[in-house]
Each structure stands twice: as C-alpha cells, then as structure tokens.
C-alpha cells in the first residue's frame, strides 16, 4: 500500500503567441480545481475507462477575477497535494490523466457551473520511494507544470511497496535471511511466504500463500506474459483481463495543434486551423524575416522582407554564424567554478550552475545559513546547497531545539549504568569493568587492559565521558 502524490506548480498560458483568454472575468469570477486519474501499466487507455489505480480531486483554488485587458497569467492554484492512495502493489509503470476544471462563481441558478479547461495525459515509469519527478504538459494553449512521486505507507517498503517491515525483535540484527529495511535501518523485512513457485520478479503477495501478478503478467504463479497478439481493436490491443489494450485516444486528444491552433478530427487523421502568422500541419511553422531581428551582436540583416524569402546576416568582427551568434571560443579558459558548465552564446558567456551554487561564474555557495538560527548555542555549517546545525553538547535535532538524551544510545558497555550530566554523560561501571564507557575489563590480578588509571580513580568508579 502507498500514496501517489501530485503537486501542481503552475497552470497558465503556454509559450508562443495565441495566448488563451483568461477563463475568469469580472462578471464571472471563477476558481480552479484539478482531478487526477491513475491507471496501471503503459496502455493507451480511453479517458473514460476506470481509474483502476485511483483518482483524486483537489481543493478549490482562490477566487480569481481577470483584470480587464490583461493577458491570462498563471492562475492561482489550490493549496496542497493531490493524493491518490493505492491498496495493492505500486505497478512501476502507469498512465495518468490530469484535468483542470473551472468553477464559475457568478449568479448561476442552481449553484456554481463547472467546465473542463484542459486535460493532459501521459504514460510514465516511476519507482516508489524515489525522488519527485518533474513534468511539463501542454493542452492546446495551456501549459501545466507539476511534480509527482509514489511513496509506500509503513510497513510497506521497496520500489513496488511489496516488501513489509517490522520493528526489530533483537537490538542488533535481523532474523535469519531477513535484511534491514532501508531507509528504516532499525526495522527488519518481515517474513512473508507467498505461494510456492510464485515468480519473485512478476508476482507478490500481501497475505501468506497467495500469488498476485504485477501488470503485464498472468497465470497462477505470474510466469505467463500477457499476450497482445490476439487483439482485434482497430486502435490496438484491448483490456487488461484479456491481455489487450482498450481503444486509444482520438487524433485530437491532447490537441496536437501548436501555437493556439484548434483541432478537428477528419476521417483519416486531424486538421489544424492555425492562427494568423502560423502554418503547417500542426501550426508549427512561423516565417522569420528581418523584421524579427534574427541577427545577433549588431549583425546587419539583408533581404528576407517576407516569410518566403531568406535573410542574410552580415556579422561584425569577432562574430560568426548565419545569425552572428557565435563568438570566438572563450570557454576554454574554464571560467565556471564548482562544476558549472560553460556556454558560449555568441553574444555572451554563461555558466550554468549546479544546484547550491550561483553567480556569474557559479562562485557563490548559496548561503544556506542566512536567516537560519541554530538554537541553544549551535552553529550553522553550510555547504553544497544544504545547511545543518552543529549542536552544543546536550542538544540535537535539525535546529538544535531538541534536548538530547545522552543516555538514549545506551553508551555504557557491560551492564554499566548511564547518568545524564550537565556536560555529557557518566557511566557507572559494573564490577570488573572500567573506562569512559566501561569498555575495558579489569584483569583478575588487578591489572587492567588500560594504561594505568588516572590517580584517585578506582575500577568501578563512575567515569565521566567527556
């Protein structure tokens, strides 16, 4: 079991001309919400087919009213994540549909009106427990930016959330044949015996003795690949139970027309009606002329008065290329620091910095300690784009706000008793042991395995650990 999490970062007009009109107006204020639908596997499934992995609806976003005459900005979004719980194994490959809905808040009779603004779909591969994956999808003139991840709910762990973890029964190690559960190193993999012969790669069980198959596999032991050869659907194989895929999307799904073009289905494919200034099968071609200023670095543009005739750039000294965009190589001086990569853009040099660094030459380690106080006398240590607190004795936690129990880790060996002390901890050793942590046995003849104890300290006395 686990949760698929979706974070919407922005929804607004996509790149290029033909920006969409704002979905809200002063007369009809509105707010957005999102719906996500998940299906297992990589099958091209119709939008109407059930969301077998689950679905979720976001909260409503803030009310938005268009400013008259202003272009549609990125629209205000609902707070929080969309979470889709899944009960079974995470399939690893999945299809998604994300819909952006508009709720109009005018004086409609019978309450608010809902309408679908945009729908994006895709097929992805994702291991549970991995990092957030970022994505950009476009639907017509709208662009949606989002991140997603799948995470297991305890006690499940692993890339498919099929391994189970249990607290350790013994303090030091797991039982025979059982591994520690990364990242929960204090827990152990729980023994779970599936049906004998159940494929370890393609099957799993949540109850002892069962054998359930991952997407793409079938049979009592999940050893038989699902066949896709016996399908007759015109758009490809269909339905997971028969091992076939259901009919795929129509030619206009996801709107193949770029730059604000509108799509209409034709008997054989689709047709784009393009806005002014664009042409081509998908409205993807725009003519570049001298009026567009194609020559960089002071290059002089000649010809190209209309989109069908070429232009030529006459470059000033020190620049070359058909757009005068290339300067003589300057990156060989390796001006970028801290792993930044040097880009010679012709008109300028640019360092593309790695995460945690900034500045024209990536020379600044981002000051992660700025504005971050470490409590209780702790000092901030920065590096590599992350900050941490080095805490004073007796304190711990991210910001040194937690009082540390120096005895929590049971530091006194051989049955020694631990006492918290203002400057650390003190071990009172059991008879026969000595040392700061009672780690040294005292030999029967009175000699110890240590160099001579400091004057005045008898074996068995409390030892203060400094």
């Amino acid at each position: 079991a686990g949760v698929f999490e979706l974070q919407i970062h922005s929804f607004g007009p996509g790149p290029g001309p033909g920006a969409p009109r704002s979905p809200c107006s002063a007369r009809l204020p509105c707010r957005l919400f999102f719906r996500v639908c998940l299906k297992p596997g990589l099958s091209e499934e119709a939008a109407e087919s059930p969301c077998a992995l689950g679905a979720a609806l976001s909260a409503r976003g803030p009310v938005y009213t268009e400013q008259p005459g202003a272009p549609a900005p990125d629209l205000p979004l609902p707070d929080g994540l969309l979470q889709v719980p899944f009960r079974d194994a995470w399939p690893g490959t999945f299809s998604f549909i994300i819909e952006t809905w508009r709720e109009e808040l005018g004086d409609q009779i019978g309450g608010p009106a809902w309408s679908l603004l945009a729908r994006v779909a895709g097929r992805r591969r994702l291991a549970a427990g991995g990092p957030w994956a970022r994505d950009i999808q476009r639907a017509g003139a709208w662009e949606l930016r989002f991140s997603y991840r799948a995470r297991c709910e305890p006690p499940a762990v692993g890339t498919a959330c099929t391994r189970l973890c249990r607290p350790r029964s013994a303090p030091s190690r797991c039982g025979p044949g059982l591994r520690p559960c990364a990242p929960l190193e204090d827990e152990c993999e729980a023994p779970l015996v599936c049906r004998a012969g159940c494929s370890p790669e393609h099957g799993f069980c949540e109850q002892p003795g069962e054998c359930r198959c991952l997407e793409g596999w079938t049979g009592p032991l999940c050893t038989v690949p699902v066949s896709t050869s016996s399908c007759l659907s015109p758009r490809g194989p269909s339905s997971a139970t028969t091992g076939c895929l259901v009919p795929g999307p129509g030619p206009c799904d996801g709107n193949p027309c770029a730059n604000g073009g509108s799509c209409s289905e034709t008997p054989r494919s689709f047709e784009c009606t393009c806005p002014r200034g664009f042409y081509g099968l998908r409205c993807e071609v725009s003519g570049v002329t001298c009026a567009d200023g194609p020559c960089f670095n002071g290059g002089l543009c000649v010809g190209g008065a209309d989109p069908d005739s070429a232009y030529i750039c006459h470059c000033p000294p020190g620049f070359q290329g058909s757009n005068c965009e290339k300067r003589v190589d300057r990156c060989s001086l390796q001006p970028c620091r801290n792993g930044g990569l040097c880009l010679d853009l012709g008109h300028a040099l640019r360092c593309r910095c790695r995460a945690g660094f900034a500045g024209p030459r990536c020379e600044h380690d981002l000051d992660d300690c700025a504005g971050r106080a470490c409590a209780n006398g702790g000092t901030c240590v920065e590096g590599g784009g992350a900050h941490r607190c080095s805490c004073a004795l007796g304190f711990g936690g991210r910001d040194c706000r937690e009082r540390a129990d120096p005895c929590a880790a049971r530091p006194c060996a051989h049955g020694g008793r631990c006492y918290a002390h203002f400057s650390g901890l003190v071990c009172a050793c059991a008879p026969g042991y000595m040392g700061a942590r009672c780690e040294f046995p005292v030999h029967p003849d009175g000699a110890s395995a240590l160099p001579a104890a400091p004057p005045g300290l008898r074996p068995g006395d409390p030892q203060r650990y400094l």
């Epitope: 965009e325 190589d329 390796q334 990569l341 010679d344 853009l345 012709g346």
Partner: antibody, heavy 124, light 111 residues
Framework: QVQLQQSGPGLVKPSQTLSLTCAIS??????????WNWIRQSPSTGLEWLAR?????????DYEVSVKSQITINPDTSKNQFSLQLNSVTPEDTAVYYC??????????????WGQGTMVTVSS | QSVLTQPPSASGTPGQGVTISCSGS????????VNWYQQLPGTAPKLLIY???QRPSGVPDRFSDSKSGTSASLAISGLQSEDEADYYC???????????FGTGTKVTVLT
Amino acid sequence: QVQLQQSGPGLVKPSQTLSLTCAISGDSVSSNSATWNWIRQSPSTGLEWLARTYYRSKWYNDYEVSVKSQITINPDTSKNQFSLQLNSVTPEDTAVYYCARGGIVGAPDAFDIWGQGTMVTVSS
Amino acid sequence: QSVLTQPPSASGTPGQGVTISCSGSSSNIGSNPVNWYQQLPGTAPKLLIYSNNQRPSGVPDRFSDSKSGTSASLAISGLQSEDEADYYCSAWDDWLNGYVFGTGTKVTVLT
C-alpha cells in the same frame, strides 16, 4: 580521431541489472571540457537522455529524474571509459542505448561523438 | 515522452527547401541553445547544428536554423536524396534539469 566503443549484453531478464560500458579513444574521460552521456532510443519514447558524468576539478554526475533511483553512471580513469548501470529493468527499458560525448568547448549540450549503439532487449 | 514538439513528417522534391519546426517552452528553448541531429536509418544520430546555428565541420551550409522565443526551426535548402533521414531538435531544460529531445521529423525526398 575520437571514437566511442560500446560493449554490454543485448538481452537482459526483467528485474535484473543492465550494465553497459563505453570505451573512449582519442580523448580522455577526465577531460576538463567534455561531458560523457548515456542516451537511449525506443519507438515508444523516442530519444531519451539518461545520465552524464564529467570532470571539472572533481567528478560530477547528473541523472534524468524519472530514472534517478534506478541508474548509476561511473567514470573509470584507469581504463578511460565510463559505464551505465540500470537496476530492476522491465520490458519498457528495451531500447537502443548510446553513449555520447558533449565535447564542443562552449557547447556542452551538443553531442558531437556517438557510440555505435547497443540494442538491449528486456525479456525473460 | 518528448518535451519538444516536432511535426512527424516533412517532404520536398530535390532542389526544394524544407523547414522543420521545434516547439518548446521557456525553460528549454526559451533559455538555452538548440541543437539539431540527423539520424540515417540504422545509424546513431549525428550532430548537425549546435548552439543556435553553429555547424560542425563537414556539415554543408544548406542546413541552417533559427530560434524565436520558445520555438526553433531547421531549414534545409537545395534538398538532396541523402538528406532523407530523421531529424531531432534538443536543448537543456532548466526546469527538468536534464536534456530534452524533440519527437523527431522524418524528411522524405520525393522523386
């Protein structure tokens, strides 16, 4: 003349680890101006960049975020090569895998030299 | 899933010109150089144009590209039979923190 020679198995079983190696001749894996990349191509996903390694006073690695948890790229200066490891493969990882150099000074994003490609099939 | 969008096909007769578009967004084409690759059947891709209209040695000047905002295009003038291939655009994406490629365009030389 710079050349990249790929080696590795053409068939891998599901859930196993795919390991590929790219041997470099005519350049150095620890060059201060190149990046060394793995890219794959399949009919369903097209060209897909997977990972890169490069040296600028120290080694840096970058990974495509959706495969980050599965993948490892390693430079080997003693053999002047770099390798790719892809764990827990599934049939969706079936593709032609290429190694490539981003070797033009000032244009680290341009892959000017490519390996011959390795067709990898994931099947039991 | 490719982040950069190209038309699936383009064609022309020998001697004609053909243009291939590549549509992206502000985080890739809008803020980074665009590269173009040519892939002949059964071979690895070959760098055709890099950093907005630089050509590696050996690439004829019949190939040129231009960029405007979040779109780029590759122009092939004086089409020849050996230009029949798949063409891909690519760029670094600051948002995804990785390289992205176009969907690819198959250029056919009609005879």
